[in-house]
């Protein structure tokens, strides 16, 4: 595969990663698929420094990140360990709230208006952030 050495047009480089900030909304799964088709993933926040960077770019707007518990435990989309990793939940969150009346609980994490995290209904059409790492060889499969 080929290595990505610089960010695509309209992406922002920061600490050897590239970030793309949507200005429109999609359900979490559609945002996840969108990022994958860009050879990226929904943003995975691994440090306070990265949290502040993303927060600066998204402003006070609900925005999906690459964290969900749709299959039970909380998981980052790139496999980063959740239990030992960086967290920035709002107080009392995540709460898997069922009182919204939309069916089920809340399985997808997003940045809230103050940057801290909340779990919400995955179908809500929030903005999203894609991330891809520089110097990572693209996984181009061999042709059979």
């Amino acid at each position: 595969g080929s290595e990505r050495t610089c960010c695509p047009v309209n992406w922002v480089e920061h600490e050897r990663s590239c970030y793309w900030f949507s200005r429109s909304g999609k359900a979490w799964a559609d945002a996840d698929n969108y990022c994958r088709l860009e050879d990226a993933h929904l943003v995975v926040v691994t440090s306070w420094e990265e949290q502040k960077f993303v927060q600066h770019h998204i402003g006070p707007v609900n925005t999906w990140m690459g964290l969900h518990d749709q299959n039970g435990p909380w998981k980052w989309v790139d496999g980063t360990d959740y239990e030992t990793g960086f967290k920035n939940w709002r107080p009392e969150q995540p709460d898997d709230w069922y009182g919204h009346g939309l069916g089920g609980g809340e399985d997808c994490a997003h940045f809230t208006d103050d940057g801290r995290w909340n779990d919400d209904v995955c179908q809500r059409p929030y903005r999203w952030v894609c991330e891809t790492e520089l110097d990572k060889a693209s996984q181009e499969p061999p042709l059979l």
Partner: antibody
Framework: EVQLLESGGGLVQPGGSLRLSCAAS????????MNWVRQAPGKGLEWVSV????????YFADSVKGRFTISRDNSKNTLYLQMNSLRAEDTAVYYC??????????????WGQGTKVTVSS | DIQMTQSPSSLSASVGDRVTITCRAS??????LNWYQQKPGRAPKLLIC???SLQSGVPSRFSGSGSGTDFTLTISSLQPEDFATYYC??????????FGQGTKVEIR
């Protein structure tokens, strides 16, 4: 000039296989996700499959899942669609289409001329 | 999947007429709506993306509007080269993009 040129269509019996190709030129092929869209005779357009620029991510319509495979060779600027276990309802003109995306803008901005696939005994 | 329904399925009009085609989504798609034109024996051509943005080179007599579930393609003054089939397409649901069934614009 940005161009897509499909080939590989033809007549095949039910249960048979066919491999379509799409040769791209005039743009940085590896930077774009590519799609196959089909149109049955006298019918509308149906999205079939998409592959990311690197080839690492693929998706399929339910109607072809498990039977069709999409792939690409970025060194040859070529997109492929391997069609197995073909059925009469797969009869259509198959178009390759370049995806251009930027949030709100998520479109098929360039299309090939199409290649006709007929599944019949 | 999100279903897209166009109306009418066909219409007859004269050169100079104002033509309106509507497209309805089975659920809200915000402004993720594109329009394509297809002439017989040819590949589709992108006309309008994200509801109202005209693709480069598309004449200004074409316009799009709407939001949520209801959308409209308008041709302000129909020209001979506009006789074709028009398709709407939603791009909200990635990647299960779906098209309307098409509207054929014929010469009266």
């Amino acid at each position: 000039e940005v161009q897509l040129l499909e080939s590989g269509g033809g007549l095949v019996q039910p249960g048979g296989s066919l491999r379509l190709s799409c040769a791209a030129s005039g743009f940085t092929f590896s930077s774009y996700a590519m799609n196959w869209v089909r149109q049955a005779p006298g019918k509308g357009l149906e999205w079939v499959s998409v592959i990311s620029g690197s080839g690492g991510t693929t998706y399929f319509a339910d109607s072809v899942k498990g039977r069709f495979t999409i792939s690409r060779d970025n060194s040859k600027n070529t997109l492929y669609l391997q069609m197995n276990s073909l059925r009469a309802e797969d009869t259509a003109v198959y178009y390759c289409a370049k995806r251009n995306s930027s949030g709100w803008h998520d479109v098929f901005d360039i299309w090939g001329q199409g290649t006709k696939v007929t599944v019949s005994s | 999947d999100i279903q897209m329904t166009q109306s009418p399925s066909s219409l007859s009009a004269s050169v100079g007429d104002r033509v309106t085609i509507t497209c309805r989504a089975s659920q809200s798609i915000s402004r993720y709506l594109n329009w394509y034109q297809q002439k017989p024996g040819r590949a589709p051509k992108l006309l309008i993306c994200s509801t109202s943005s005209l693709q480069s080179g598309v004449p200004s007599r074409f316009s799009g509007s709407g939001s949520g579930t209801d959308f409209t393609l308008t041709i302000s003054s129909l020209q001979p080269e506009d006789f074709a089939t028009y398709y709407c397409q939603q791009s909200y649901s990635t990647p299960t993009w779906t098209f309307g069934q098409g509207t054929k614009v014929e010469i009266r």
